[in-house]
């Protein structure tokens, strides 16, 4: 696994462990929490990320408007089971054998139940919509320039393929990023559109996973983007299975500062 | 440590042009915009513009349109504020400051050079 | 343009003393910034977005404020505080500064 071969770290995740101890005292990097060896050339998956994270020390409309099965993660952080290759497992528990289905971004798409419950194969997040507003400016953001810009910060900063960059909407202040990537579009290598949306997410927070970088600074032809909100809705191949009572029980909840955690039905 | 460091003082004559730079260090010149604020004698601070190093993008207060231009090097991370047309009311003191920012926070002016007086007379 | 009234023009304090200086937008504005500055020095950043300290400024001062009132304190003055301060906004273009508040001692 490559990472800097000076100082021993992994560019692309802080929260790891790195040591000159691979072949031929190459510098190899294991994720905190699960101990995992992870490639520093590209993004660490989400399910090694959320980890590594709990084992720390503590009108005209031309928006997007999500479809009703879309869900948003309304659980927030828990410690998650990962495979061998660091994704998210189908089926996830907590101490007090509570279980429930998760898609590939590790967001819960069942009701909870018992360790009974059967999650038959991890359905895949093909869809993620970012919904951000942004912080007044002095000067006013150019829609062909912010769409520029943001396609470069995922193609450049998250090394997402273009491709996958399926729209960005901007209706001040609410600007939308559309990720999509089907599970047949995916080939080996391909920086998974949930482990983009995740990066995407902690830097919009001011949490940035990438090793001895400054905060995310995000600009269009000079002036700054800043964030005020952020919700990220995901969307699965197969729709996620909740109960009518679920269904019908309660809306949306509003979404202030960064990311809210709810299921958004309409 | 972040620094700015402004050229030294000048004497123009009316309708003269000066040129003054801005050498940043410490830190990557291309990540932030750099401004130009001046003082005029037992007068407020007014802000003149800003020029960001990694597109060359520049914003200017129209009350200086036409006579002032900011140019970069960044082959040097330096920043020049030229300003035509000279008038005695030109006479201040200019200083550069770079503005620091994020998605989460914009950081304000921080740090400032030390100042260049500029003093125009015939 | 968006014009910054500062206010008083100057407060005559002694040291350990509250300073209060206030800044008042002719529209309203999302942040403040605070300047300090010294005769024949630079200004020096003391507060961003409104409420945040720059680094390595002393907790003594804070800054409060929303829509077109903002205040800038400085809970118990120190010799080195005697200064003038400055708001600025960053709402719309151009930039403005308030005229300034002159802190000296009584």
């Known amino acids: 696994h490559t990472a800097a071969q000076d100082n021993c770290t992994c560019p692309t995740n802080k929260m790891t462990v790195c040591s000159p101890d691979g072949p031929g005292g190459r510098c190899q990097c294991r994720a905190l929490g699960s101990g995992m060896a992870v490639d520093c050339s590209t993004l660490t998956s989400k399910c090694l990320l959320l980890k590594a994270r709990m084992s720390a020390p503590k009108n005209a409309r031309t928006l997007v408007r999500p479809s009703e099965h879309a869900l948003v993660d309304n659980d927030g952080l828990y410690d998650p089971d990962c495979d061998p290759e660091g994704r998210f497992k189908a089926r996830q528990c907590n101490q007090t054998s509570v279980c429930w289905c998760v898609n590939s971004v590790g967001v819960r798409r069942t009701d909870k139940g018992d360790l009974s419950l059967r999650c038959d194969e991890l359905v895949r997040t093909h869809h993620i919509l970012i919904d951000l507003r942004h912080r007044p400016t002095a000067g006013a953001f150019n829609h062909s320039d912010l769409d520029a810009e943001l396609r470069r910060l995922f193609r450049e900063r998250y090394r997402l393929h273009p491709k996958f960059v399926a729209a960005v909407h901007y209706e001040q202040p609410t600007i939308q990023i559309e990720l999509r990537q089907n599970t047949s579009q995916k080939a080996a290598g391909d920086v998974d559109i949930g482990d983009a949306a995740y990066y995407f997410e902690r830097d919009i927070k001011g949490e940035s996973l990438f090793q001895g970088r400054g905060g995310l600074d995000l600009r269009v032809r000079g002036e700054p983007l800043q964030v005020e909100r952020t919700l990220i809705y995901y969307l699965d191949e197969i729709p996620p299975k909740f109960s009518m009572k679920r269904l019908t029980g309660g809306g949306s909840g509003g979404g202030s500062h960064h990311h809210h955690h709810h299921h958004h039905h309409h | 440590q972040v620094q700015l460091v402004q050229s030294g003082a000048e004497v123009k004559k009316p309708g003269a042009s000066v040129k003054v730079s801005c050498k940043a260090s410490?830190?990557?010149?291309?990540?932030?915009?750099i401004n130009w604020v001046r003082q005029r004698p037992g007068q407020g601070l007014e802000w003149m513009g800003w020029i960001y190093p990694r597109d060359g993008s520049k914003k200017y207060n129209e009350k200086f349109k036409g006579r002032v231009t900011m140019t970069v090097d960044t082959s040097t991370s330096t920043v020049y504020m030229e300003l035509s047309s000279l008038r005695s009311e030109d006479t201040a003191v200019y200083y550069c400051a770079t503005r620091f920012a994020t998605v989460v926070s914009n950081y304000g002016l921080d740090p400032w050079g030390q100042g260049t007086l500029v003093t125009v007379s015939s | 343009e968006i014009v910054l009234t500062q206010s008083p023009a100057t407060l005559s304090l002694s040291p350990g003393e509250r300073a209060t200086l206030s800044c008042s937008a002719s529209s309203s504005v999302n942040y403040i910034y605070w300047y300090q500055r010294k005769p024949g020095q630079a200004p020096r950043l003391l507060i961003y977005?409104?409420?945040n300290l720059a680094s390595g400024i002393p907790a003594r001062f804070s800054g409060s404020g929303s829509g077109t009132d903002y205040t800038l304190t400085i809970s118990s003055l120190e010799p080195e505080d005697f200064a003038v301060y400055y708001c600025q906004q960053w709402n719309s273009y151009p930039l403005t500064f308030g005229q300034g508040t002159k802190v000296e001692i009584k």
């Open positions: 977005d409104t409420s």
């Open positions: 410490g830190y990557t010149f291309t990540s932030s915009d």
